[in-house]
């Protein structure tokens, strides 16, 4: 006799709320003989033995409740014109019973936690009744083939919701269980799926780069945000507003909206977005320079690739700071920023920093009315020897017959660092150069006592790191003030 | 990789002066600073030059009195001390870094430190 449970040729079980007792098995080879299957009491009427005709090219039969008792074990086997066609299975039709399905209730409970959860309530099944059930769950995305099952499974004697974990925003769900009697067999048949939908998550930090709270007109400000799920694309809806007046920017992509001049404040929200949270609020307004923080500093942080930054707490305390640094030369979308309570005055930027490269820096005090920033201050992780040198100029004589000169700054990504000091050199044709330092402050010099004939200048700019290659050279024809490039 | 070594250090009669000076060698600072400790105080900012020397900076405690100055031949920065008081007493240390902003007197931001040299000034 094959042991209850275990799969083989022949599988009985009860079904539904009636009783029924289901048998069902593999397809025979001879499929016009019907067989005969045989179900005998082994508990309560040991000497009773039932006949069950099949229908031909059937193969399953169900065996009518009048024909047993409820708690009872059945032996069964089948024939096929008189010789055996399986071993004889045992059935215990206390465990043997395949339970409809669970009910799962339409209402989803979604919270964003370190991940986006959901959670989902469910009811037994009506049948078997009194009894303590196994139910195993399973979810997927809408447009999935395959399922994964949630773990663990639950009991029906205390009803624990179903919960999935670490999904994705803005994306359809299926979730489906089904049941099976405690240290019993078979499972019931899944049950028809729920389908949800997750919501669009709303930007986690929005910040704004650019100069909003310029006072030369040269306001050119970006509303930046950081995407809370990189892989997923979303667009978003953004509202502008000053006074009485809104702008709303519609199938934003992620993750900036240009900031229309005089704006006070600024809303992201997901494109469609049915929320469960506020929406995230930016005050744009401009608060006055002693509420900003004060005597920002930068220095490359030592045994680390960072910068360090501090600054003193202006003249109140803010909700929070923001420290934002961008490299030179880069468009106002590749902004960094990290927030920071009230109490810290001071971070150490998180990212690998390039030697040689410079970093704006600045750390603004945000306030429940608005913002006020501190100058922005350029720092180096490390500072390189410049790669060029300035460019050089003929400005009028001063005194008449005393030639001046003048050059520019070099950029700041050639720099590569900060201006230490100038060498200017000039050399006589066949003489030696004669160059001197100057302050990087300077940017002129006056060449008196030079004889008649004919010079060339140039001009380096020297970092901490050392001195760059010269500038382009200026010719210089005495006494007739001609002047030609090299 | 920068060292640092402090000179000058005594004592000296309320009133008096001291020179100190700080020897420089190595590359990539830009500021250098003195500091000093009083026993039983928090270390504190004095005075502050950029590498360069066009830009100076002094606690309000010694404006007036001290200044500081650089010798780029030497590679030394010099802090000259004058009329000095008995509350000027304490380890002085001279410091480096590679700081920008207006964060002159922070130590956080000067990671390179000399020994120090004692500075005493009696009544």
């Known amino acids: 006799t094959r042991p209850h449970g275990s799969p083989g040729p022949l599988q009985c079980y009860s079904v539904g709320p009636l009783g029924i007792l289901n048998c069902s098995w593999e397809p025979l080879g001879d499929l016009e003989t019907p067989p005969v299957l045989y179900h005998q009491s082994q508990k309560y009427h040991p000497n009773r033995v039932w006949e069950v005709k099949v229908p031909s090219k059937q193969s399953w039969v169900t065996i009518p409740r009048e024909q047993f008792t409820m708690a009872d074990k059945l032996l069964i086997w089948g024939t096929q014109k008189g010789r055996p066609l399986w071993s004889s299975v045992s059935v215990n039709l206390e465990t043997q019973m395949k339970p409809d399905t669970p009910q799962i209730f339409s209402q989803v409970d979604i919270s964003e936690e370190a991940t986006l959860e959901a959670t989902v309530q469910w009811a037994p099944p009506v049948w078997p009744p009194q009894k303590v059930l196994i139910c195993q769950f399973r979810y997927k995305e809408c447009q999935a083939e395959t399922w994964t099952r949630l773990e663990p499974q639950l009991k029906t004697d205390g009803l624990t919701p179903v919960e999935m974990q670490n999904l994705e925003p803005g994306t359809c769900y299926q979730v489906s269980g089904r049941c099976q009697v405690e240290n019993g067999y078979p499972w019931g048949e899944w049950s028809s799926p729920l389908s949800f939908q997750t919501p669009f998550l709303d930007p986690e930090d929005v910040w704004v780069s650019g100069t909003v709270c310029e006072t030369s007109g040269k306001r050119a400000a970006l509303l930046v945000w950081k995407d809370p799920r990189p892989c997923v694309q979303v667009t978003y809806t953004v509202w502008f507003g000053a006074g009485d007046i809104t702008t709303t920017q519609e199938e934003v992509p992620c993750c900036k909206s240009p900031v229309p001049a005089w704006m006070e404040w600024a809303v992201v929200s997901p494109g469609n977005s049915t929320s469960w949270v506020p929406p995230t609020n930016l005050s744009l307004v401009c608060l006055a320079p002693e509420s900003a923080p004060c005597d920002v500093g930068v220095s490359s942080a030592d045994g680390s690739p960072g910068i360090k930054v501090t600054w003193k707490q202006g003249t109140r305390k803010p909700l929070e700071y923001v420290v934002d640094w961008a490299q030179d030369g880069d468009s106002l979308d590749k902004l960094n920023w990290t927030r920071l309570p009230p109490g810290n005055l001071s971070t150490l930027l998180p990212g690998e920093f390039k030697g040689g490269v410079p970093y704006r820096i600045t750390v603004t005090a945000v306030y429940s009315g608005g913002l006020a920033a501190a100058p922005s201050v350029w720092g180096f992780r490390e500072e390189l020897v410049p790669l060029a040198g300035p460019a050089v100029w003929r400005l009028p004589d001063d005194p008449p017959g005393t030639p001046v000169v003048a050059w520019g700054e070099v950029p700041r990504h050639q720099l590569r660092g900060q201006a230490t000091h100038y060498t200017f050199c000039i050399q006589s044709r066949g003489l030696s150069t004669v160059c001197r330092n100057v302050s990087s402050q300077t940017q002129t010099a006056t060449l008196p006592n030079l004889h008649l004939g004919s010079f060339k200048l140039w001009v380096t700019v020297s970092t901490v790191a050392g001195q760059g290659p010269p500038g382009p050279n200026l010719s210089l024809h005495l006494p007739d003030n001609r002047i030609r490039w090299k | 990789q920068v060292q640092l070594q402090e000179s000058g250090g005594g004592s000296v009669q309320t009133g008096g002066s001291l020179r100190l000076s700080c020897a420089a060698s190595?590359?990539?600072?830009?500021?250098m600073a003195w500091f000093r400790q009083a026993p039983g105080k928090e270390r504190e900012g004095v005075a502050a030059?950029?590498?360069?020397?066009?830009?100076?900076y002094y606690a309000d405690s010694v404006k007036g009195r001290f200044t500081i100055s650089q010798d780029n031949a030497k590679h030394t920065v010099d802090l000259q001390m004058n009329s000095l008081k008995p509350e000027d007493t304490a380890m002085y240390y001279c410091?480096?870094?590679?700081?920008?902003?207006?964060?002159?007197?922070?130590?956080?931001?000067?990671?390179?430190w000399g020994q120090g040299t004692q500075v005493t000034v009696s009544s």
């Open positions: 410091a480096a870094g590679l700081v920008y902003g207006e964060a002159w007197l922070d130590s956080r931001h000067y990671n390179k």
């Open positions: 190595g590359y990539s600072i830009n500021r």
């Open positions: 030059i950029s590498i360069g020397g066009d830009r100076t």
